[in-house]
């Protein structure tokens, strides 16, 4: 019999690389059975993630899997860092893994770094 | 169950280019990570890199940073490594291999394929 | 790049008997998210590696319970309680906290 607990599926050390001034959607994939949880999205800062309070957000209903977005119109170059979702059933706290946004300020397409050599420079988090 | 089936040439000259393909099956790469790993002739295991098939992106070892390209076909669900400027160190079983993003729960290895770099 | 260092590079054990390998990582394997990637494969000849254990101690499904993972940090190791004839097998540590992935240099478990 399938699991009726929160699932959040966003992959452990997931990645995306995304342009300054593009708009963007983090999204959160979450399964649940009944009733559908709190979820909300923060920002980490260290080891402490930082609640995103006023933030557009929005869910995207899908038939097995529903999606918990977190709007960037448009993306800035401070967007750039590691983001997580928690979702909150039962009195339980669901985390996610981390999802890491690499921010390229916008440049001339040929200046633009790749995505390889965005993930070889973990400096542009701090 | 999840499987993975290698495919590509045994054999490539040297300055050329290696080209090796791994088709899952058994899981919908998006929700995996696939990575590349090799084995030398009587060696032990090295990492080359692995994609996040969902958005393409990708992380090498450096020591082939330069070299490896590693790509993803979620319509076909399979994966692909490129090597290029192959000489003989680079003569090795080359394995693919997948995991479950989220949860570690599963992590399935190809069969491996047998490449020699050999004028 | 992390180094994993197992110990010994080679060991005979008697049928029955107990085997333990050891894996020292050169910096701690604990991640952010309090969870430690330490993962144990198993190659037997002519095969490709297999996964036993992950997450320091998890069994994969189908992994008889002979073998079990402990340690933490830097420190780990992985035990066959009473080895079998089909145990015979190089043994691989691997971390998945940090790129790049870096595997030891195996053991090689023989039957005596």
């Known amino acids: 019999k399938e699991s009726c607990d929160v699932q959040l599926y966003i992959k452990r050390q997931s990645e995306h690389s995304i342009l300054a001034g593009d708009p963007f959607e983090l999204e959160c994939p979450v399964k649940y059975c009944a009733n559908r949880p709190h979820v909300t999205w923060c920002k980490l800062n260290g080891t402490t993630c930082v609640k995103l309070e006023d933030r557009q957000t929005s869910w995207k209903e899908e038939k097995n899997i529903s999606f918990f977005i977190l709007h960037f119109e448009p993306v800035l170059p401070n967007d750039n860092g590691s983001y997580r979702c928690s979702a909150n059933f039962q009195s339980n706290l669901i985390e996610s893994h981390s999802t890491t946004l690499y921010v390229t300020d916008v440049k001339s397409a040929s200046e633009r770094p790749s995505k390889d050599e965005m993930a070889s420079r973990p400096w542009l988090l701090y | 169950q999840v499987q993975l089936q290698e495919s590509g040439p045994g054999l490539v000259k040297p300055s050329g280019t290696l080209s090796l393909t791994c088709a899952a099956s058994?899981?919908?790469?998006?929700?995996?990570?696939m990575y590349w790993v090799r084995q030398p002739p009587g060696k032990g295991l090295e990492w080359i890199g692995r994609?996040?098939?969902?958005?393409?992106?990708?992380r090498y070892n450096p020591s082939f940073k330069s070299r490896a390209t590693i790509s993803a076909d979620k319509s076909k669900n399979q994966a692909s490594l490129k090597l290029s400027s192959v000489t003989a160190a680079d003569t090795a079983v080359y394995y693919c291999?997948?995991?479950?993003?989220?949860?570690?729960?599963?992590?399935?290895w190809g069969q491996g394929t047998l490449v020699t770099v050999s004028s | 790049d992390i180094v994993m260092t197992q110990s010994p590079d080679s060991l005979a054990v008697s049928l029955g008997e107990r085997a333990t390998i050891n894996c020292k990582s050169s910096?701690?394997?604990?991640?952010?998210?309090?969870?430690?990637?330490l993962n144990w494969l198993q190659q037997k000849p002519g095969q490709s590696p297999k996964r036993l254990i992950y997450?320091?101690?998890k069994l994969d499904s189908g992994v008889p319970d002979r073998f079990s993972g402990s340690g933490s940090g830097t420190d780990f190791t992985l035990t066959i309680s009473s080895v079998q004839a089909e145990d015979l097998a190089v043994y691989y540590c691997?971390?998945?906290?940090?790129?790049?992935?870096?595997f030891g240099q195996g053991t090689k478990l023989e039957i005596k």
């Open positions: 994609i996040d098939p969902a958005n393409g992106y990708t």
């Open positions: 910096q701690s394997l604990l991640d952010s998210d309090g969870k430690t990637y």
């Open positions: 058994g899981v919908n790469i998006k929700d995996t990570y």
């Open positions: 997450l320091v101690s």
């Open positions: 691997w971390q998945g906290t940090l790129f790049p992935r870096t």
């Open positions: 291999a997948v995991y479950d993003g989220y949860y570690e729960s599963f992590d399935v």
